[in-house]
């Protein structure tokens, strides 16, 4: 064979974001017939090699980015995508609180803000039901973010947690849930996506607002600017191309 | 639930002997690298000796107990020992199995505290003189 062998996959089961004390399990995932597997954990010259490292009490010390490749007689793979494994828990919830408040007409606009105790510069806000399972979700690292106009698409639940960047792999326990909900709609199936949405955003100052826009075709904070995304191809038909414009703060 | 449990402690006179015993379970023992630390009020805990299964079993020791300290491993009954020896007064400390998940590539990795991800509770070694 010429070249590298492909790269395996690495997944965190259930889920890379693991409470402390709580079990979790990596797998590494090549072709069949693999000779070995090489797990590491990046920046600590610590590893294993098996594919499988069952984590039966999340521990800070194993919180991090981990990689694995694998070898073919002589040959190794390219590593795998590297995974970021998350301590959750490590610190005390902040609160998240929605302004003007957590009910909201269709079109109207609302900001959720994620506020901690901690002089912490990072922040992560997940909608319940996403990401896929095993999928990490998009980040982003920006200060603010401005309001974007609400769709039907952004009901649901609502947490957030907070974290240090000088730490970013221990982070809070989650925010109690906060419930958005979206009035004055009229959601045709075609106008859904076929999957959850996976946004998560991460930004700085203790206190943060947040504006999100759930569509699975543009999830964007650009401040004043007329958006106009194209559906995915693994998406069923959704009509026209649909236009978001986000306003300044 | 991981839990590690040390035993053995006591207070000895100096030139005299311990035989600390750590009991785990919970862990996959077998793939886990095994360390002692100690340590003293007000200061860092010290790394004392580790024991892996790495290519058949690879044991080190800090060089303050070398040649008086044994760190020895059971796997069928998950047990590690630590065996002292030509105790002094300065090995008086609180004593802790540590336990790490994974292997080390690097010289001084398994001395670090950062590279264990289970402690036990300690155990207190008194040497009199």
């Known amino acids: 064979q010429s070249g590298p062998l492909p790269k395996p996959s690495l997944q965190a089961l259930p889920s890379s974001l693991v409470p402390l004390e709580k079990p979790v399990t990596l797998r590494c995932q090549g072709p069949p017939g693999v000779d070995l597997y090489r797990l590491e954990k990046l920046s600590s010259s610590r590893y294993q090699d098996q594919a499988v490292l069952f984590i039966p009490a999340m521990k800070r010390s194993l919180a991090g980015r981990y990689r694995c490749s694998y070898q073919n007689g002589s040959l190794w793979s390219l590593p795998s995508d590297q995974l970021e494994l998350v301590a959750t828990g490590v610190f005390a919830k902040p609160s998240l609180s929605a302004q003007p408040g957590p009910a909201v007409s269709s079109g109207g606009d609302v900001t959720l803000q994620c506020q901690t105790r901690y002089g912490f510069d990072q922040f992560a806000l997940y909608k319940e039901g996403d990401p896929a399972p095993y999928k990490n979700p998009e980040r982003w690292y920006r200060a603010s973010f401005p309001i974007i106009t609400v769709t039907a698409a952004h009901s649901g639940t609502y947490r957030c947690y907070s974290f240090s960047s000088r730490d970013p792999y221990l982070w809070s326990a989650p925010s109690d849930p906060l419930e958005l909900v979206v009035t004055g709609t009229s959601v045709t199936p075609s106008r859904l996506p076929t999957e959850p949405p996976s946004p998560v955003a991460e930004f700085s100052e203790a206190t943060a607002e947040l504006t999100v826009s759930f569509t699975n075709e543009v999830f964007t904070t650009e401040t004043s600017r007329s958006i106009t995304a194209s559906p995915k191809e693994s998406d069923s038909p959704a009509g026209p191309a649909r236009q978001y414009y986000t306003k300044g703060n | 639930q991981v839990q590690l449990q040390e035993s053995g402690g006591g207070l000895v006179q100096a030139g005299g002997s311990l035989r600390l015993s750590c009991a785990a379970s919970g862990v996959t023992f077998d793939s886990a690298a095994m360390a002692w630390f100690r340590q003293v009020p007000g200061k860092e805990r010290e790394f004392v000796a580790v024991i892996s299964t790495e290519s058949g079993g690879r044991t080190d020791h800090a060089d303050s107990v070398k040649g008086r300290f044994l760190i020895s491993r059971d796997n069928a009954r998950h047990m590690v020992y630590l065996q002292m020896n030509s105790l002094n007064p300065e090995d008086t400390a609180v004593y802790y199995c540590?336990?790490?998940?994974?292997?080390?590539?690097?010289?001084?990795?398994?001395?670090?505290?950062?590279?264990?991800?289970?402690w036990g509770q300690g155990t207190q070694v008194t040497v009199s003189s």
């Open positions: 540590a336990s790490s998940l994974l292997y080390c590539s690097a010289s001084g990795c398994y001395a670090n505290r950062d590279s264990y991800d289970y």
